[in-house]
Structure formats: structure tokens, C-alpha cells
């Protein structure tokens, strides 16, 4: 009876999410393998988040709006491990917007989800950021490594969206 009611709850939750995400990919987790954590298909998952790489070339503001429509934000990178996971799926000859910007050009960088900007956990390429007119951040491959660069916000780029996993 307990299992039946849990299944019914799951199904109703799935139906609720289906209007936003036509397909979810779920895995069982938790100590009793009773919880399901899901990401929209074909998003990828790492720890408690889901990631989507958009190959549509758009400005930073349009890229953030595009993520927002999907219930996400442009990616906020919190650790080197997270960055290493994300870059496995990126093309080395492309650049991708991050959820990091400096709208006033005062070198006051801010993450889209209001996570505090911690200078000690940043992965700027050497010599970057280097221009107060370049107020948005991308991740790209340079000098044999992935890192961040400041660029013009209005210049179309690919982008990466991030959202919290859906638990059912």
C-alpha cells in the first residue's frame, strides 16, 4: 500500500512536470534507492544539477532569457570539478556564455543566481578579464586548457544552462 501511494504520487508529479519537459531521464538514488532524481532529456546531470548546452548563437541577455524559459539560468560554476564535468561536452573551437556578468563595467562580477562572486574560485584565462567594455563571461579552450574570458555581451555566442535536479 505504501509503495502504491508513492508510485501514484510520483506519477502525478511526473504529469505535473510533463507540461514543461516532455521527457525526463531519472535515476534512483538515496540510501534505500527510493528517491528518483531527474533531468529533462537530453540534459546531462552532475551532482544536484542538470546542464544543457545550447548551440544557438545568441547575445548574453537572450541566452539568459532562453535558459529562463526552460526553468534554468546560464551556468554558475562553483568548483573545478563542476567545470571539468561541463567541459567534457564542449567543443574546443567554440565559446559558451556563463551566467557571469559585470553590467556596469566596474569589474564587479556577479552570478545570475546571486551566488557571491568568489575571486578564489574563478578560472579566468591568464590576463583575463581585460576590458571594462567586455561585460559578460564565456568559457573557451585556450593555451591547452578551458578557462574564462570577458567578451562583449551583444556578440552572439553558444551558451550553457543549469538547473536544479527534479526530485520525484
Amino acid at each position: 500500500n505504501f509503495m502504491y501511494s508513492k508510485t501514484v504520487k510520483r506519477l502525478s508529479k511526473l504529469q505535473e512536470y510533463q507540461q514543461y519537459y516532455p521527457s525526463l531521464t531519472c535515476v534512483m538514488e538515496g540510501k534505500d534507492m527510493e528517491d528518483w532524481s531527474c533531468c529533462p532529456t537530453p540534459w546531462t546531470s552532475f551532482q544536484s544539477s542538470c546542464y544543457f548546452i545550447s548551440t544557438v548563437m545568441q547575445s548574453w541577455t537572450k541566452s539568459q532569457n532562453n535558459c529562463s524559459v526552460m526553468g534554468a539560468d546560464l551556468v554558475v560554476i562553483n568548483t573545478k570539478e563542476e567545470q571539468d564535468f561541463i567541459t567534457q561536452n564542449l567543443k574546443i573551437n567554440s565559446a559558451y556564455f556563463l551566467g557571469l556578468s559585470d553590467p556596469k563595467g566596474w569589474r564587479h562580477w556577479q552570478w545570475v543566481d546571486q551566488t557571491p562572486y568568489n575571486k578564489n574560485v574563478t578560472f579566468w584565462h591568464s590576463g583575463e578579464p581585460n576590458s571594462p567594455d567586455e561585460r559578460c563571461a564565456i568559457i573557451n579552450f585556450r593555451s591547452e586548457e578551458w578557462g574564462w574570458n570577458d567578451v562583449h555581451c551583444h556578440v552572439p555566442q553558444k551558451s550553457i544552462c543549469k538547473m536544479k535536479k527534479i526530485y520525484i
Partner: antibody, heavy 121, light 111 residues
Framework: EVQLVESGGGLVKPGGSLRLSCAAS????????MSWVRQAPGKGLEWVAT????????YYPDSVKGRFTISRDNAKNSLYLQMNSLRAEDTAVYYC??????????????WGQGTTVTVSS | DIVLTQSPASLAVSPGQRATITCRAS??????????MHWYQQKPGQPPKLLIY???NLESGVPARFSGSGSGTDFTLTINPVEANDAANYYC?????????FGGGTKVEIK
Amino acid sequence: EVQLVESGGGLVKPGGSLRLSCAASGFTFSSYGMSWVRQAPGKGLEWVATISSGDSYTYYPDSVKGRFTISRDNAKNSLYLQMNSLRAEDTAVYYCARQLYYSYGYYFDYWGQGTTVTVSS
Amino acid sequence: DIVLTQSPASLAVSPGQRATITCRASESVSFHGTHLMHWYQQKPGQPPKLLIYAASNLESGVPARFSGSGSGTDFTLTINPVEANDAANYYCQQSIEDPPTFGGGTKVEIK
């Protein structure tokens, strides 16, 4: 006082080339993105090319891509527009304009007086 | 590309009256309270001159008779009261995304 002075315009045959120059003074030229904007006779404004302050980024509309090249010489405080394979529809007054960044975009806060390019056989 | 449609194409106004020009964008040019729409004035034989930046900010040296408003896709330039030397073409321009685009222009004539 900010000044932008264009030169290099003239009459050219279809298929020909011209190089426009813009001499900047009164501001730190190397700190600003610059653009060329044109205006065909009796028509509106059309953006033609942009170059970033550090020369790392150039951008063109499809109408001129592959034919026009924007460049700059920060040591000479000069902006250039190399125009090749010119067509009758490139006939216009060409303005050099300074970009001032605001939030996620920019606007053109100073414009030169313009130089006239006429493409005709 | 973002298309900007200005209206009317032309208008005639008497001195002392109000002139209103609208600019509609094919998609939003606003983001989190910042509106990346700008207005220019161009008199015959002269280059464009910046009047208003970011929808409502008056450029230094521009008379307070000029004002701008709007957000998202709909923006307005108002001249109130109109003076004889306001006869000119007026253009809107967006810069939220490359390529930067201009409206087709509005010709203001003084009656």
C-alpha cells in the same frame, strides 16, 4: 573636444575599391569601440562595421561581409574601412562613430561629419 | 536581426505643441530593468546627434524638452514643447544584440 574626421570618399566604378579613414582626437582612442554607419541618399541609417577597442573583435552585416574590412591603428588614432568589390547600392555617406558602452549594450555618442562614396559607371 | 519600426513616418507640429514618435522592436530590447534603446536627431546635411540613451537618459547638452520612455518592445520619444529648430529626422537604435539596428526614421516638420 571629441572630433572624428572622415576622408577617402569619392567616385568609383562598380567592382572598384576605396579605403576610408577616420582621424580621431580629443579622447583616448584606444579605449573605445568604433563603428562605421552609412546613409544612402534620402534613406535611413545602416550600420556597416564594428571593431572593438583592442582590435579583438570585428563584425559586419551580411550585406558587406567578405567585401569590407574594418581596422584601426591605435598608435595613429585612426579607424579605417577597406571597401572592395563595390556595388551601386554601396553609394552613401559613410560616418565613423564612437561607441559608448552602457550595461549589456552600447550607443553611438559621437559621429564624424561623413564622407561621400559614389559607385557609378 | 531585431527590426525596429518607427511611426509615424512623418509628422507636422506647430511650435509649442507636443510631438510623439514611437519605435516598436520585433523582440524585447530590455533586460532586468535596462532598456537598450537609443534616440538620435539628424538635421539635413549633418551627422546624427545622440539625444537619449537607454530609453530615458538625456544626453548631456540636450534640452529637457526631449524625453524618452518605454520598455520591452515599445518606446517613445517626446518633444514638448516643440521649437522651430527641432525640424529634423529622428531615429531609434537598439544595441541589446548584434547587429545594431536603426528604425526607418521619422521626419518632424514644423508648421
